[in-house]
Structure formats: C-alpha cells, structure tokens
C-alpha cells in the first residue's frame, strides 16, 4: 500500500489531466481525490499513466467503493481494467453491453481469460439472462468467450438465441456446457429439414445423447470424423458397427487413424471383432469371436 503523506498545496488536483503523469506514486495518493477520479474516469484512459500510477488510481477507487465499482466508473476503466482481478470484478453489477464491449476491447491481446470470464458472468447476472444482444456482442468481440460461462449461466440462454451462435464460438466448450446447449439447439432447429438441421446442430453434438446419435445414423448425414471424435463417450459406446458405418458414411475410413484415441478406442473394445472386420480397415481390439458378453451392471441393478 502507498504510504500516506500530505499533499503539497502546489500539487493539489482539481481535474484529471495529463499533468498527473509527472506525479510520483505518493503524490498521486495524497493529492487525487477519489470522488474526483470517479467523476472524471472518462479522462483516465487518454492519459499515458504508468502501470505503477494505475495501481495508485485503482487503490483510490477500491477505497471509495469497497463493495464494488458503479457501472458509471466501470464503463470508463479503459486500461485500468487490466489491473482488475476476478475477485474485484465479482463485486460488480454490469448491465450495459457498451460497458462489456469497451472492456473486451481493452482485454484483447492480454492474458485475462479469468477476468473476462468473470466479467461476462456479471453481465449475464446483471441482465437476468443470456439474451440475443449479449450473445451477439460476445460472438463479435470475444469469439470463444461463450464457453467461459458456467453450465448454470448457459442454462439461461433461450433457445431462440441459439441461432446466433457460430461453430467457432463453441470450439472451447466442454462436455458439461454442451450438455446444456445441445437440448436448446435441438429445440431451436427442430423445424429444419434433415441436411439443414445437421449443419446447424453439428457444433452442439458434443452434448447429444445416444438416442439422438442413433437417430442421426438413419438420416444419411455423413458425419465428419472431427465431429464424431467430439461426441460424448457415453453416446458413442452403445452404437453398433452398422450404426457407426451409417452415421459416418465415407468418413468411416478415417476410423483407422483414430483407432487409439477416445472415444473410438473405447468403442472398438465393446464391438465384436467379426463386426469390426466388416469395416475393412483392420481395426483390432474387439471382442474375440465365440466370447460371451456379460453385462454385470444389469445384474447388480436387479439384486
């Protein structure tokens, strides 16, 4: 923390301007009134403060707003946002997408994924749900940021908004997030024809259950291998060789390269070797011919 000193009369600050860049840390601390700083935050970003000086300004705002900054201040943080920790941001209440845009622009090119994720979370909380305008802002200013939201936050996305989500926005989404988004996408695209539906639903399929994957295998979709590899392991394991062959179409030839990778490896282990041989790829590791498969989990459930 900056040591307290008295402000020399000739250094008293009546407005936030460029002259402050010549102030030492302790002079800034002593001479800048926190309320004045807050009122003139829109000027701060135009002044080339050092990182050390920004630390002092942040400290002043923290003292003035121990419960979190008001949005009027947050909107004009500019490069001061780079000094914020996720803990700081967690105290904020943000509803304006202009604020979100401004801070996303500032964070670009900086290692601030945790801060950005927390900021987006605060915006969703502040606005009550992840509406279309918020999604549009995220996809435009922060591709991939949608996946920084928790499954709980994503559950507030109305299905009508799903159409605004692009495939690249889902690249970093984990299984739990896709589990939330997939049913919404299914609902959003339910009135589309087969091929159009598949194109739209494909980025969300990492959250699809087995029955939906099986249904797709009956629709001549020719799922590409990259999409297949992103399916939930639990959704792939119950598929038969015939279903996988139908699901992938010509893409089934790519299974050979993925033979050692999940979920293909795990799926192979559950198939009869005879059935795997019909794929014509020399896939190995299936259940040998003549072996009996006992599903002990069923017996345990009954006892």
């Amino acid at each position: 923390d900056v040591e307290r000193t008295t402000c020399p009369p000739e250094k008293e600050v009546h407005e936030i301007d460029e002259s402050l860049i010549f102030y030492k840390k302790r002079e800034l601390e002593a001479c800048v009134d926190a309320a004045l700083l807050a009122a003139q935050m829109d000027r701060v970003d135009a002044i080339p403060f050092t990182y050390e000086q920004l630390d002092v300004l942040k400290h002043k705002l923290d003292e003035l707003y121990p419960q979190g900054y008001p949005e009027s201040v947050i909107r004009h943080l500019g490069h001061l946002f780079l000094k914020m920790s996720p803990e700081d941001i967690r105290k904020w209440n943000v509803t304006s997408l202009e604020t979100l845009k401004a801070l996303l622009k500032v964070s670009k090119g900086h290692e601030m994924s945790a801060q950005v994720a927390t900021l987006i979370d605060r915006v969703v909380v502040g606005r009550g749900q992840l509406d279309k305008d918020t999604v549009d802002t995220l996809t435009a200013f922060c591709p991939g940021c949608l996946c920084s939201l928790s499954p709980e936050r994503l559950s507030s996305v109305p299905p009508s908004v799903i159409g605004a989500v692009r495939p690249q926005d889902l690249d970093t989404c984990g299984p739990r997030q896709l589990d939330v988004l997939y049913p919404k996408a299914r609902l959003a695209f339910q009135n589309m024809s087969g091929s159009e539906y598949f194109v739209k639903i494909r980025p969300f399929l990492g959250g699809a259950p087995t029955e939906d994957v099986k249904a797709l295998s009956q629709q001549n979709v020719s799922m590409d291998l990259a999409t297949f590899m992103k399916l939930r392991r639990e959704a792939v394991l119950p598929l038969t060789v015939a279903e996988v062959q139908k699901l992938l179409g010509p893409h089934v030839e790519g299974l050979k390269v993925e033979e050692q990778h999940s979920p293909v490896r795990d799926w192979i282990l559950k198939q009869r070797q005879d059935d795997l041989d019909t794929l014509g790829l020399g896939l190995q590791g299936g259940i040998p011919n003549g072996y009996l498969i006992l599903d002990l989990s069923v017996r345990e459930a009954l006892s």
Partner: antibody, heavy 121, light 107 residues
Framework: EVQLVQSGAEVKKPGASVKVSCKAS????????MHWVRQAPGQGLEWMGN????????YYNERFRSRVTMTVDKSTSTAYMELSSLRSEDTAVYYC??????????????WGQGTTVTVSS | DIQMTQSPSSLSASVGDRVTITCKAS??????IAWYQQKPGKAPKLLIH???ELQPGVPSRFSGSGSGTDFTFTISSLQPEDIATYYC?????????FGGGTKVEIK
Amino acid sequence: EVQLVQSGAEVKKPGASVKVSCKASGYTFTNYWMHWVRQAPGQGLEWMGNINPSNGGPYYNERFRSRVTMTVDKSTSTAYMELSSLRSEDTAVYYCARPYYGSSYGYFDYWGQGTTVTVSS
Amino acid sequence: DIQMTQSPSSLSASVGDRVTITCKASQDINKYIAWYQQKPGKAPKLLIHYTSELQPGVPSRFSGSGSGTDFTFTISSLQPEDIATYYCLQYANPLRTFGGGTKVEIK
C-alpha cells in the same frame, strides 16, 4: 511386397461398358479400402471413388455416381471398377490405388500400373 | 467437395534452380496434403505426405510446407531426373481431390 496389378488395355465403342480389374497382393486385402483414380490424356488426376473390400460398400464421386460400379472379390483379392454408357471423354488411364492410414483419411502410397481405356467408334 | 487450385500449370527452369509449386485448398485442410511425381506413361509416385513428411528414399531436395489452405512444394536444386508433372492431393476429406498438376521442364 505390396503390389497392385491391373488388367490390360481395352478399346470400347461409345455406349458400351468396361470392367477394369486390380489384383492386390503383399498385404491383407480386407484391411485397406481400394480407390480408383482416372487420368484423361494430357489431363490431371481425378478421384472416382472407393470401396470397402470387406463388405463391398462403395462410395462414389458424384460425377460418376450414375455410371460407375465398384465391386470386390475377396477370394481372389481383386477389386473391379465398371464404367457404363461410355463416351469419348472416358478415354483415360484408370488406376487403382491403396491408401496408407497415417493421418486423417489416408493418402495413396501404392498404385496399380494403370489400365488404358480407349472409347472410339 | 474441397477444390485444390495448383499453380503454375507449367514451368521451365534450369538445372540447379529452385522450383516452387503452390496448392490452395478451398477450405481448411489442416496439414493433410500429399505431393506426387508422375512421369509419362507411369503411375504417380508419392514424394511427401502430411505437408512436409518425406517418403523414405525420396531425395532431400524435395520439401513441402504450409497449413490450413496454402501449401508449397519446393525442389531446392532442380535435377534432370526431376522432369515430370507434380500433383497435390488433399486427404482431409474422404472424397479426395487432386490439384490440376504442374508440368516441370528444363530450359
């Protein structure tokens, strides 16, 4: 040593069909799909389609779908490509090719010597 | 389908020259491109796969680079035996496609 040996040159009349064979040896025939590629005189290479030698399931290039039939005979490790309703533009060298599944869908590491098909009235 | 645009369609160079051929894919194919050499009356011969991996026995003067949509094949010092037509092949999609070919001649 892997070898793909194709049938000899053919001369056909427009409207006729031609069936080219490709006998594989030196590897397990049912472990690699067989592909067919053609090359018209002075032109580039054109992928026609492929076939799963284990279950006989083919996938064709849309351009040939209505006229091409690919089959296999597992007992002799032979793949066949039949092209019907021949026209002069089908005059070409037809190759069978075996992929190596090193990455993605596999690149062709072994080729037949080619079969010249001439369509002329 | 993925289109492969290869250029130039032909080139003439002197022995010892550096020769460069490019292939442009109509969509991202990662690094799934192979390069072939074909001499008159012969089947294509695999030189390079996965953009830059040289096949065993292929001289080191042949090389490849690129990723995504733009790829380059280079002969660092052209030799008389390199007179042939060269083709790129994309195998990022099961429906394979070749470039139009580049005929390399000696000046």
